[in-house]
């Protein structure tokens, strides 16, 4: 057959679906690879063909669309499972072609088992809620397109294993789960189970997400440099090791890039000839406020090094701050014998 533009295996779109639940999978060609949509392709006479490779097999085979109750079907650019089975796991390929054009992409589909408490190997999306911020909500994700708007599904929310009912500050409202106040105790996995009828059958969609309660933007402050500070002087003799920690507190800020860096005489350490090393450690509070520590280390400091300016800098979306470390050369203590001799006027 003629050449086909093969986009390969799109592992970026590792699709995971639960066993024994409906799944609708859109052909990634139109979403990520081609500049036109399915309708345009279809009206131009292109045909979308699906096939798959079973798990641990090399053989590509057509998808059987003649299973009882149309368990697997295709509708436009969507491959439907009603429902999935464990052995549907494999690599799926959608190919768009006519006599003169061909383009295809493969993607992995993993059918995952869950236990009665919704635990599974599924990778969970994380939804961040601001602590003590006011009314916030999460929405049951990825349920669009499974049933028409005329169908009114029933939705049950769970936190971990427990049905959310009279949960005090957490209120189920259909597809939404409202948090009147978000507290650290609200951290955890939340599951919505959507139940809807279709052609005399009842289907369930299970969606789990992780809620993480984080610092509120109303409480956010510019970076705070705890060290260096005015109370600590780094007094060293030449030849000793100089260690200066730069410890900075960053309030949690959604999508903020937190940065800490040292300058020595106004230059980045990489741009000067001193043998300096910098080690960084990061810790987080329960609300994802961040403390970064960068330790500047000069193994054998020279008297020249002790005259330099060492400045710790920090930046976040809230602002930029800097603080110089107090570094000085230790004055050697006078030797006792010399001091005595001088005291008695000895020459």
């Amino acid at each position: 057959s003629e050449r086909c533009d093969d986009w390969g295996l799109d592992t970026m779109r590792q699709i995971q679906v639960f066993e024994d639940e409906p799944a609708r999978i859109k052909c990634p060609l139109f979403e990520h690879f081609l500049k036109f949509n399915y309708s345009t392709a279809h009206s131009a006479g292109l045909t979308l063909i699906w096939y798959w490779t079973r798990q641990d097999r090399d053989l590509e085979e057509p998808i059987n669309f003649r299973l009882p109750e149309n368990r697997i079907s295709k509708e436009k650019d969507v491959l439907w499972f009603r429902p999935t089975l464990l052995n549907d796991t494999g690599n799926y390929t959608c190919m768009l072609r006519n006599t003169t054009y061909c383009s295809k992409v493969a993607f992995p589909l993993e059918v995952v088992q869950k236990d009665s408490c919704f635990n599974s190997p599924m990778k969970l999306p994380v939804h961040k809620l601001y602590i003590e911020y006011g009314i916030q909500r999460i929405t049951c994700p990825n349920v669009d397109g499974y049933f028409p708007s005329s169908v009114k599904p029933t939705i049950t929310w769970y936190m971990g294993c427990y049905k959310i009912q009279n949960f005090n500050n957490v209120i189920p409202e259909g597809m939404n789960l409202s948090f009147l106040i978000a507290l650290i105790s609200n951290n955890g996995n939340y599951t919505c189970v959507v139940t809807y009828p279709e052609n005399g059958r009842t289907f369930h969609l299970t969606r789990t997400l992780t809620v993480k309660v984080v610092g509120s933007p109303k409480n956010a402050v510019p970076p705070v440099i705890h060290s260096p500070n005015d109370h600590v002087v780094y007094e060293k003799e030449p030849g000793e090791e100089l260690l200066i920690p730069c410890t900075v507190y960053f309030s949690f800020l959604m999508d903020s890039r937190n940065e800490v860096w040292w300058t020595i005489d106004g230059k980045k350490p990489d741009d000067i000839t001193i043998d300096v090393t910098i080690n960084e450690s990061i810790s987080h509070s329960r609300t994802e406020d961040e403390t970064r520590t960068q330790i500047l280390s000069i193994k054998k400091v020279t008297s020249e090094d002790l005259k330099r300016s060492y400045v710790c800098h920090a930046r976040s979306a809230k602002g930029e701050v800097a603080k110089a470390a107090k570094v000085k050369q230790k004055v050697p203590a006078p030797r006792y014998t010399v001091e005595l001799a001088c005291g008695f006027g000895a020459t």
């Epitope: 003590e132 911020y133 006011g134 949960f167 106040i181």
Partner: antibody, heavy 122, light 110 residues
Framework: EVQLEESGGDLVQPGGSLRLSCAAS?????????MCWVRQAPGKGLEWVSC?????????YYANWAKGRFTISRDNSKNTLYLQMNSLRAEDTAVYFC?????????????WGQGTLVTVSS | DIQMTQSPSSLSASVGDRVTITCQAS??????LAWYQQKPGQAPKLLIY???LLASGVPSRFSGSGSGTDFTLTISSLQPEDFATYYC????????????FGQGTKVVIK
């Protein structure tokens, strides 16, 4: 004793302004509370006006009809809730109640003041 | 905005009667419904929240039921102090938020 006490109600001319206060005693505004205003026109039913979150964010919420004319605020250090009412109309004549919402108890409106009367008339 | 329709607008009853007041929401409010009692010249008093939970200090003759759009307040055996006006109140947090009261039901002595 846990209670709310409204003040500031008065006779005001149409187009005028008024600031109502609600002093809380026996409890402190906290991050588990929303503080709200509800009004009741003479001989009529209850109507929600506005709420404010008593936590640090101080997020505010208004009934659609109240947006732009009414402003809710609070001073946690004084344990006092306020409602600034501007461009007052005859139909704003009502008893104004302040109420506490317990967010840690399914959002129950568990404490109400006795109300203060606002009369808008020329 | 959600509309709350209370019925009846008033009812006559005798001490000891079982009284039922209904409240209908224009769209689903799930279990986000409260009931209040108000006497002339007084503030409303919370009776029921989250559709069926009895507020602190409220006698057990008051009960609430329902979810979605249809809700009921029941007084199992009317007492003299129960003659008052009763209001339902919906809460919608995911859109808004918005709190809406019913127009009230006045319970009078037959």
């Amino acid at each position: 004793e846990v209670q709310l006490e409204e003040s500031g109600g008065d006779l005001v001319q149409p187009g005028g302004s008024l600031r109502l206060s609600c002093a809380a005693s026996g409890f402190s505004f906290s991050s588990s509370h929303y503080m709200c205003w509800v009004r009741q026109a003479p001989g009529k039913g209850l109507e929600w006006v506005s709420c404010i979150y008593a936590g640090s964010s101080g997020n505010t919420y208004y009934a659609n009809w109240a947006k732009g004319r009414f402003t809710i605020s609070r001073d946690n250090s004084k344990n006092t809730l306020y409602l600034q009412m501007n461009s007052l109309r005859a139909e704003d004549t009502a008893v104004y109640f302040c109420a506490r919402v317990d967010a840690s108890s399914s959002g129950s409106w568990d404490l109400w003041g006795q109300g203060t009367l606002v009369t808008v008339s020329s | 905005d959600i509309q709350m329709t209370q019925s009846p607008s008033s009812l006559s009853a005798s001490v000891g009667d079982r009284v039922t007041i209904t409240c209908q929401a224009s769209e689903s409010i799930y279990s986000n419904l409260a009931w209040y009692q108000q006497k002339p010249g007084q503030a409303p008093k919370l009776l029921i929240y989250a559709a069926s939970l009895l507020a602190s200090g409220v006698p057990s003759r008051f009960s609430g039921s329902g979810s979605g759009t249809d809700f009921t307040l029941t007084i199992s055996s009317l007492q003299p102090e129960d003659f008052a006006t009763y209001y339902c109140q919906s809460a919608s947090y995911s859109t808004g938020p918005d709190w809406t009261f019913g127009q009230g039901t006045k319970v009078v002595i037959k």
